[in-house]
């Protein structure tokens, strides 16, 4: 049986269970490599608290569908001698990146993973050519998620006081310089995730290879390397590579860009100091505050929440946007979409799409940007399931109360982006992380 | 406060079975993990049994197919059921709660002895 999610084989995924204390390693393609799973265990469940080993999915048992992969095993569940056996699951999404399996909870029989991938898309639009795993788990097994600097277009440009280079770069996966080809850029190579610009020219100085790295709790490594045996005539024949690290800062602090801090014969150090190199907890609720000791920051957006069937309105253009965030409220044109964006065609006003669900809701601080996601919403044509973006400005003398009101500011592959100013988004800094 | 009590343990025969109860008290029993350890005479503690907060269970190769965790939740409490006892299985058993916010609570024991 030919392997279901091609792009997704070549590395050993970790999906937690932080509540019980429990690493899961996944390989959807063969099995991973640990002993104590045995030697055709796809899903391999890793007690730390008691330091035992269980395999929870065997390769040889697997069975897919385009948005569902089964591992089962020969293992009983319920110790009575019945046909239950103990198996895996894992529903697949459309996502704009290779993504991560996360854990979503686990019965006596089923251990259920969900994961948003672009490997599960209907088209390849948001396929790279090279993407490595972008997430790691440290030693207390909280999960630093670099995918949201993931660029699907353009690059970062490197801060470096050479004036006749620019070094380009993208994070776990290689520029693509069709969707956005800004004039620097045009020139790279494909496959290249560091591009090194110099006059009219430019050169690949290094491709994703492996995924990211923790080296210590609060640093981050990814390496680059040039695959082709060919050398650069400025590089005194050494081959090119570029190491990353991403530092997560001591305390709450604006966002940087990345910094050249070494080149020697092409080799070059890049640090970047971003908080989304921070474990996820530190950065994200589920909920529409952030707040505690674990977050050094007060945020509280649940004062925007609509009630009695109003909705906040924006305008764009060929839609009205209906947005009730922060609660769980029906947006009366949605039809019962459970929907916290509802995008409404003007000239057809029976064209109702949810843009992002009420119960799929992120609230992101980091790097000084505070951001509501709602994703889950209704798929477009690539399978990707409509999302919205909500990128959140501080401004006391905001009207309606306060509140201010959300202002469209444009789409890309479905996914809606808003900014809203209000008195509420005035973040309240602690100062001991 | 928060505490563990173990009871049911006792002498029984090779093959006989016993059913040990751990009650909880001052936690969320539900979003607790629960895992049976025991220590036999002269030997280091030893994982016996977990029932996770989602419920999944595992068991350790020595006691698979014969002990089976189980919990009521509204009677805050977690079950061994232990069937076929051989001598080996003789231990003083401990039950263990843990969630991402407390620490390690353990209860302080009961005995099982299994012996014609």
């Known amino acids: 049986q030919a392997a279901p999610f091609p792009e997704l084989c070549s590395y050993t995924w970790e999906a937690v269970d932080t509540k019980n204390n429990v690493l899961y390693k996944i390989n959807i393609c063969g099995s991973v490599d640990i002993v104590q799973c045995g030697p055709s265990s796809a899903v391999c469940m890793h007690d730390l608290k008691t330091r035992t080993y269980h395999s929870v999915g065997d390769s040889v048992l697997r069975s897919a569908t385009r948005s569902l992969l089964e591992f089962n095993t020969t293992v009983s569940c319920d110790q009575q001698g019945t046909n239950h056996r103990v198996q895996s699951s894992i529903a697949f999404l459309c996502g704009k990146t290779l993504g991560t399996p996360e854990f979503v909870t686990a019965t006596e029989c089923v251990h259920y993973f969900e994961w948003r991938t672009t490997a599960a898309c209907k088209k390849d639009i948001f396929k790279a050519n090279k993407e490595v795993p972008c997430y790691v788990f440290d030693e207390e097994l909280r999960k630093h998620d670099l995918n949201p600097l993931i660029k699907l277009s353009g690059a970062y440009l490197v801060d470096d006081s050479d004036p006749d280079t620019s070094l380009f770069i993208n994070v776990c996966r290689d520029i693509d310089t069709l969707r956005d080809p800004g004039s620097q850029l045009r020139a790279c190579p494909p496959g290249t995730a560091a591009c090194l610009v110099r006059g009219h020219q430019a050169f690949d100085v290094g491709q994703p290879r492996d995924g990211l790295k923790v080296v210590r709790k609060d640093r981050l490594v990814l390496s680059y390397v040039r695959e082709e045996a060919g050398k650069l005539d400025f590089c005194d024949g050494h081959s090119p590579a570029v190491t990353i690290t991403f530092v997560c800062p001591s305390e709450r602090r604006e966002g940087t860009i990345p910094k050249l801090t070494a080149k020697s014969n092409c080799r070059y150090e890049i640090e970047w100091i971003t908080e989304y190199a921070c474990h996820r907890d530190y950065l994200e609720s589920k909920t529409c505050s952030l707040s505690g000791e674990q977050q050094d920051v007060s945020i509280d957006l649940t004062p925007l929440a609509q009630s009695g069937g109003s909705s906040y309105i924006s305008d764009g253009k060929e839609y009205l946007f209906y947005l009730n965030v922060c609660g769980e409220t029906e947006i009366q044109f949605c039809n019962k979409k459970q929907a916290a964006v509802c995008q409404v065609k003007k000239s057809d006003t029976s064209q109702v799409k949810a843009a992002g669900r009420y119960h799929n809701q992120t609230l992101r601080y980091s790097d000084g940007f505070l951001t509501l996601i709602y994703f889950g919403g209704d798929e477009c044509s690539s399978g990707f399931q409509r999302m919205s973006v909500i990128n959140f400005e501080c401004n006391k003398t905001a009207g309606n109360d306060g509140k201010g009101t959300p202002v469209f500011t444009g789409e890309v592959d479905c996914t809606y982006f808003f900014t809203w100013d209000t008195e509420y988004a005035c973040v309240h800094h602690h100062h001991h992380h | 406060d928060v505490q563990l009590v173990e009871s049911g343990g006792g002498l029984v025969q090779p093959g006989g079975s016993l059913r040990l109860s751990c009650a909880a008290s001052?936690?969320?029993?539900?979003?607790?993990?629960m895992d049976w350890y025991r220590q036999a005479p002269g030997k280091q503690r030893e994982w016996v049994a977990t029932?996770?907060?989602?419920?999944?269970?595992t068991y350790a190769d020595s006691v698979k197919g014969r002990f089976t965790i189980s919990r009521d939740n509204a009677k805050n409490t977690v079950y061994l059921q232990m069937n076929s006892l051989r001598p080996e299985d003789t231990a003083v058993y401990y039950c263990?709660?843990?969630?991402?916010?407390?620490?390690?609570?353990w209860g302080q024991g009961t005995l099982v002895t299994v012996s014609s």
């Open positions: 263990k709660a843990s969630s991402p916010v407390l620490n390690d609570i």
């Open positions: 001052g936690i969320i029993f539900s979003d607790n993990r």
């Open positions: 029932l996770a907060s989602y419920g999944w269970k």
